[in-house]
Interface confidence: low
Amino acid sequence: KAMHVAQPAVVLASSRGIASFVCEYASPGKATEVRVTVLRQADSQVTEVCAATYMMGNELTFLDDSICTGTSSGNQVNLTIQGLRAMDTGLYICKVELMYPPPYYLGIGNGTQIYVIDPEPCPDSDF
């Protein structure tokens, strides 16, 4: 079953390569188990950036080696992607799945275009 997912159209990563955005889904039922996946689409290729399964009302936790962190509040997920470089510029799609209880719902956002600008290297100092 389809579910609406909203996310911002454009986000500019910080100079430290960190980008944050909110992924909001219109939950049609009372889900207890939710899975959030961030997909990156670039040059017609879709790759999974990170994923987390969480229980409603509990903290959203990604794997220790994930470049993503996040928190959940109701039907909103606040996602942060770290370690981004200019080559990582692309469309980042938020996918939300209501895994349990049935029925299964799937929502895929239109994507957030994340622009990453590598910082200029600091000029050599005389000191």
């Epitope: 899975r35 996946t37 997909l39 879709v46 999974e48 990170c50 994923a51 987390a52 399964t53 969480y54 959203l60 936790t61 990604f62 794997l63 996918k95 799945e97 895994m99 299964y104 799937l106 895929i108």
Partner: nanobody, 119 residues
Framework: EVQLQESGGGLVQPGGSLRLSCVAS????????MGWYRQAPGKQRELVAT???????IYADAVKGRFTISSDNDENTVYLQMNSLKPEDTAVYYC?????????????WGQGTQVTVSS
């Protein structure tokens, strides 16, 4: 088609331990998530714990600190180590495998294994 076979259930005294196992066989699409659910008499089936290489391990509040989910290296088997069992843990425990992708490819359930905690 994916088949799931649970084992390890039984009768145990309060405070005791059990280890459940679930073996998945057949043609499995990756990535996938394997987890454990339980259903007590007259209650809805509820999540106990789920384990995913592409996501986080989560536990129901009622079992945190007592139950541990793990999987073997090839990820076709998932275990549930249950310690400090309580009478309220009595239920049929089901193994579940969800094949993931852009869409949910498959959602499979085992037949269940009975766990009874009683003195």
């Amino acid at each position: 088609e994916v088949q799931l076979q649970e084992s390890g259930g039984g009768l145990v005294q309060p405070g005791g331990s059990l280890r459940l196992s679930c073996v998945a066989s057949g043609s499995i699409f990756r990535p996938y998530v394997m987890g454990w659910y339980r259903q007590a008499p007259g209650k809805q089936r509820e999540l106990v714990a789920t384990n995913s290489k592409g996501g986080s391990t989560i536990y129901a509040d009622a079992v945190k600190g007592r139950f541990t989910i793990s999987s073997d290296n090839d990820e076709n088997t998932v275990y549930l180590q249950m310690n400090s069992l309580k009478p309220e843990d009595t239920a049929v425990y089901y193994c579940n495998l969800k094949e993931l992708g852009i869409y949910l490819r498959g959602d499979y359930w085992g037949q269940g294994t009975q766990v009874t905690v009683s003195s």
